[in-house]
Interface confidence: low
């Protein structure tokens, strides 16, 4: 049996994945639940099994096709339902008319690499993954650099207000270990949010040359 309020949040990665989280304030006793996606203009539908991620929330990924296939467009509406088994029946626990391109969260950028490193600066590049061609140039990025003795939360955010898949980090300390992360967000979509942060890229600046003033 289910009691209490629930929250059902989903994001589209712009290609072939809808990730959903369902939170339920009441007790959910050994019940099997799933998310069912029914597009309004496609001849397919998709289901995924909700798996617990905490005591009161469950998550699943609707895999709509090959990772880089464009499965939905800007005018698609997908009816998303949370269905939980009650005996031999399925009960609708939550429903939403999901507009994919209003609820975007892209995959984290990948293939981070150091292009060039010096004593005080480092040029880093990355690639976006599974991002729709619909966006063209309309993407922005945030980056952060982890310095020794600090946490990620303390790292200042660097904002790139255009589709620029590289950055030149300046005023770094010579011979110092750093980590770098980047995330991406389309400009489109009322409820669009930042991608997860990329995997950290570790790099070390070059030591200062002997006899030089640093």
């Amino acid at each position: 049996a289910v009691n209490g309020t629930s929250q059902f949040t989903c994001f589209y990665n712009s290609r072939a994945n809808i990730s959903c989280v369902w939170s339920q304030d009441g007790a959910l006793q050994d019940t099997s639940c799933q998310v069912h996606a029914w597009p309004d203009r496609r001849r397919w539908n998709q289901t995924c099994e909700l798996l617990p991620v905490s005591q009161a929330s469950w998550a699943c990924n609707l895999i709509l096709g090959a990772p880089d296939s464009q499965k939905l467009t800007t005018v698609d509406i997908v009816t998303l339902r949370v269905l939980c088994r009650e005996g031999v029946r399925w009960r609708v626990m939550a429903i939403q008319d999901f507009k994919p391109f209003e609820n975007l969260r892209l995959m984290a950028p990948i293939s981070l690499q150091v292009v060039h490193v010096e004593t005080h600066r480092c040029n880093i590049s990355w690639e976006i993954s599974q991002a729709s061609h619909y966006f063209e140039r309309h993407l922005e990025f945030e980056a952060r650099t982890l310095s020794p003795g600090h946490t990620w939360e303390e790292a200042p955010l660097l904002t790139l207000k255009q589709k620029q898949e590289w950055i030149c980090l300046e005023t770094l300390t010579p011979d110092t270990q750093y980590e770098f992360q980047v995330r991406v967000k389309p400009l489109q979509g009322e409820f669009t949010t930042w991608s997860p942060w990329s995997q950290p890229l570790a790099f070390r600046t070059k030591p200062a040359a002997l006899g030089k003033d640093t």
Epitope: P39, D40, R41, R42, R43, T73, T74, V75, I77, T79, I95, Q96, D97
Partner: antibody
Amino acid sequence: EVQLLESGGGLVQPGGSLRLSCAASGFTVTSYGVHWVRQAPGKGLEWVGVIWSGGSTDYNAAFISRFTISRDNSKNTLYLQMNSLQAEDTAIYYCARAGDYNYDGFAYWGQGTLVTVSS
Amino acid sequence: DIQMTQSPSSLSASVGDRVTITCSGSSSVSFMYWYQQKPGKAPKLLIYDTSNLASGVPSRFSGSGSGTDYTFTISSLQPEDIATYYCQQWSTYPLTFGQGTKVEVK
């Protein structure tokens, strides 16, 4: 058999309001999006808006401030509330539903209800 | 909004003639639909997704096209085909229709 039946049309004065109904049978309104389309006398078709299966709505920007689409699930009926009506709103108003997917186009139409705005 | 321009606005043809109506979008569309409307009646879906025949529609009706330019054809005009025909795009909101083509028999 899918059927849509509009009602509520009639004569209304400029500045007045009217609520049209669209009674659906042969399907449940919580399973399909239902649209409103209008046609002025001797003119072409104009999309007004839609209420989706989950209850959210989309409108033609030309009508968003004056028209509201809603539904009563228990009656399996859709509504189009029209406010601040003007002579140019005189038209036959149709409700329409796509096939199993919007991909199939407006496969089902009501017979229409005539709204006349005149003093 | 995507403007759909139909041509011609009206035409007169003989029974058995091939009739062609074109619909041009102000920008590219992916999904095109064609409807038939007879006086005093609601529109009737003939063609969906550019070229697919709706259920129960005679095979003399057909559709084709891509991008901004689409074509609707009646291969052999019949007396019962006297009507106004509309194109409609479903690629972006608001949904928009062409202004209609009135088909008459000579």
